[in-house]
């Protein structure tokens, strides 16, 4: 669809005569008839297959024709066509004399013709005017012409209909050849697919309008490249959605069980060495001069009872000093000036002469020790109780009073609250510092999984397109992890890929 436009510019008929040579009276009141038709090697009369148009009287004898697009499109003359422009044409322009006001062909005498020109040739669609001038013996006509496409028609022959649009059936304008030119942010055959935010993850993100990045289930972040870990995951991460891969030193389904109390809490004081001994349990190995579960107590140097033979110990800034009883001397009162005759052995100890009576040795009864049997045996000095147990002397023996959660002769055994299988219906038992926790299978809840609740949310296979189903234990719901190319809470929507 297009328009052949003919712009009349000047007509010269200086003598004011008709084609027959007869003069017009009083002058030649001139109007034009235009016939546009298919290409003919020799232009002949016949149907104007591409259209006809007539002008009103434009002047007398010789005159210039003004541009007049306002008055009904008189100049240029418009010859619209509703077909593919063939690229060739024939054009006949007749100048006629109008004796009266009726310009219809049947109302004019045949000899009212002033001049007739006929041209033919090739003409491409375009904005540029072709200027032409045709001269006969008595007249001259100057004019220009062109072919342009109608609104919304494009291409070399005005055959391509294209209308710009900006709705969900396309976001585009039209190029000169009629092809679509997508508006910024859109792509696809009809420019109906939005271009997502730059960097938006191809599989895990999508968009419904340009520069947007909406995440598929299980993904988060501005570019949908961060997975969402399992609900309740405390000290863990994920590489795919709904995982909970524990950080170092943490364990359990939700990575909330502390397996590295030493690192996370640094309980041992005064430079002691900390050893993890189970979930939330530890042992501190104290440096010399310190004691206590956490090596928090500073030992007096006299606490190790260095003075022998009943010597009394006095703390000093640079150490300690032994005050020896009569008959003893030395740094630790270890040397004796006594003999068995002085009855040096206490608590029923037996005295034995040594070195021809120059020295002696005491043989102590049970529960007593020391060179003079002066010390009651303390079986707790080696701190044999583990896990912060308190050592108690009981006559000839000792016993450990254990902290809660520990048992055994030396408190070396961790009491498992799970040992009696307290979790019902196949629940998994987890030991905690102050009790236990049951992780219930789908369909059960309560502190001991004793309450029957809903069935496994994944049991009905709610996920489509081979998606992986995960049951959210905390809400008894399911989450579908979609494979590439699908989206939706059940992975039911395929994603349109460019």
């Amino acid at each position: 669809s297009g328009v052949f436009q003919l712009q009349l510019q000047e007509f010269i008929n200086e003598r004011g005569v008709l084609a027959s040579g007869r003069p017009c009276e009083p002058g030649c009141r001139t109007f034009f008839r235009v016939c546009l038709k298919h290409f003919q090697a020799v232009v002949s009369p016949g149907p104007c297959t591409f259209g006809t148009v007539s002008t009103p009287v434009l002047g007398t004898n010789s005159f210039a024709v003004r541009d007049d697009s306002s008055g009904g499109g008189r100049n240029p003359l418009q010859l619209p066509f509703n077909f593919t422009w063939p690229g060739t044409f024939s054009l006949i322009i007749e100048a006629w004399h109008a004796p009266g006001d009726d310009l219809r062909p049947e109302a004019l005498p045949p000899d009212a013709l002033i001049s007739k020109i006929a041209i033919q040739g090739s003409l491409a669609v375009g904005q540029n005017w072709l200027l032409d001038e045709q001269t006969s013996t008595l007249t001259r006509l100057r004019y220009s012409y062109r072919v342009i496409c109608s609104d919304n028609y494009y291409g070399d022959n005005c055959s391509r209909l294209c209308k710009k649009r900006n709705d969900h059936f396309g976001h585009y304008v039209c190029q000169p050849d009629g092809n679509l030119s997508c508006l910024p942010g859109w792509t696809g055959e009809y420019c109906q697919q939005p271009i997502c935010l730059s960097g938006c993850h191809e599989q895990n993100g999508y968009c419904s309008k340009p520069a947007e990045c909406l995440c598929r289930p299980g993904w988060q972040g501005r570019l949908c490249n961060e997975c969402i870990p399992h609900n309740g995951c405390r000290h863990g991460t994920c590489s795919t959605p709904w995982q909970c891969t524990c950080d170092e030193g943490w364990g359990g389904l939700f990575c909330d069980q502390d397996l590295n109390y030493c690192t996370h809490h640094s309980p041992c004081k005064n430079g002691a060495t900390c050893s993890n001994s189970g979930q939330r349990s530890y042992t501190c190995t104290c440096r010399p001069g310190y004691t206590g579960v956490d090596c928090e107590l500073e030992l007096s140097e006299c606490d190790s009872n260095p003075c022998r033979n009943g010597g009394s110990c006095k703390d000093q800034e640079d150490g300690y000093h032994c005050l020896c009883p009569p008959g003893y001397y030395g740094l630790h009162c270890e040397h004796s000036t006594l003999s068995c005759a002085d009855s040096p052995c206490f608590n029923g100890g037996s005295c034995r002469e040594r070195n021809q009576g120059a020295n002696y040795a005491c043989e102590c009864p049970p529960n007593f020790t020391g060179s003079n049997c002066e010390k009651k045996v303390d079986r707790c000095t080696s701190n044999p109780c583990a896990n912060g147990g308190q050592c108690l002397n009981r006559g000839p023996s000792r016993m450990c009073r254990c902290r809660p959660g520990f048992t055994g002769t030396y408190c070396e055994l961790h009491v498992s609250d799970c040992a009696r299988n307290p979790c019902a219906h196949g629940g998994t038992c987890h030991d905690l510092e102050n009790g236990l926790m049951c992780t219930c299978p789908a369909g059960f809840s309560g502190r001991r999984c004793e309450v029957r609740t809903s069935i496994d949310a994944c049991a009905s296979s709610p996920c489509f397109n081979r998606a992986t189903c995960y049951t959210d234990l905390s809400t008894d719901t399911f989450v579908c992890n979609c494979p590439y190319g699908f989206v939706g809470s059940r992975c039911e929507f395929p994603v349109g890929l460019p």
């Epitope: 209308k163 059936f169 697919q193 419904s208």
Partner: antibody
Framework: EVQLQESGPGLVKPSETLSLTCTVS??????????WGWIRQPPGKGLEWIGD???????YYNPSLKSRVTISVDTSKNQFSLKLSSVTAADTAVYYC?????????????WGQGTLVTVSS | SYELTQPPSVSVSPGQTASITCSGQ??????ASWYQQKPGQSPVLVIY???KRPSGIPERFSGSNSGDTATLTISGTQPMDEADYYC?????????FGYGTKVTVL
Amino acid sequence: EVQLQESGPGLVKPSETLSLTCTVSGGSISSSSYYWGWIRQPPGKGLEWIGDIYYTGSTYYNPSLKSRVTISVDTSKNQFSLKLSSVTAADTAVYYCARQALAMGGGSDKWGQGTLVTVSS
Amino acid sequence: SYELTQPPSVSVSPGQTASITCSGQRLGDKYASWYQQKPGQSPVLVIYEDSKRPSGIPERFSGSNSGDTATLTISGTQPMDEADYYCQAWDRDTGVFGYGTKVTVL
């Protein structure tokens, strides 16, 4: 050949929600070349476009009905659905589902046979 | 809201040409579609993108669209062409139908 078939209750009480499903056979609803629409026609009156949906879930609604309309798609079942809430007698109509082709400028080249929904107590 | 106006009825003798108009503001800048609907049947697309015919639609159906008016022309009208005809266009993201024209073949 692609065929569309509407299904749902023929009678709905005032103030309730009208629910219809359109099942597509002979072709995939997941084609990127089409939108899937709902059109209705009250008895003896003209056609009224309700809204449409793309296989990705993008929806477009007639502004005059937008507050009451929800259109959804289930690609696994090759179906799309219409919900119209708070219905009145004015919503009594034959409801059609149709395929709107991008290559036809949005023209609806395939229609269901239509289902009459009457709103009455 | 955008409106498309059609004449309520058009009468034509068999073999003659029937023209149905559809008017809307700057309709020529939008694509117009035309649907034929016979009593008790679903609508059928007869013209899309102003002047294109879907496969199976007879050549006697043609269309044009410029300015504010789209026109559906049925040349050599047959009795089987008696039906309601609806024009349709898209205004932004909303589908708009004309009120419909009843074509009677006398």
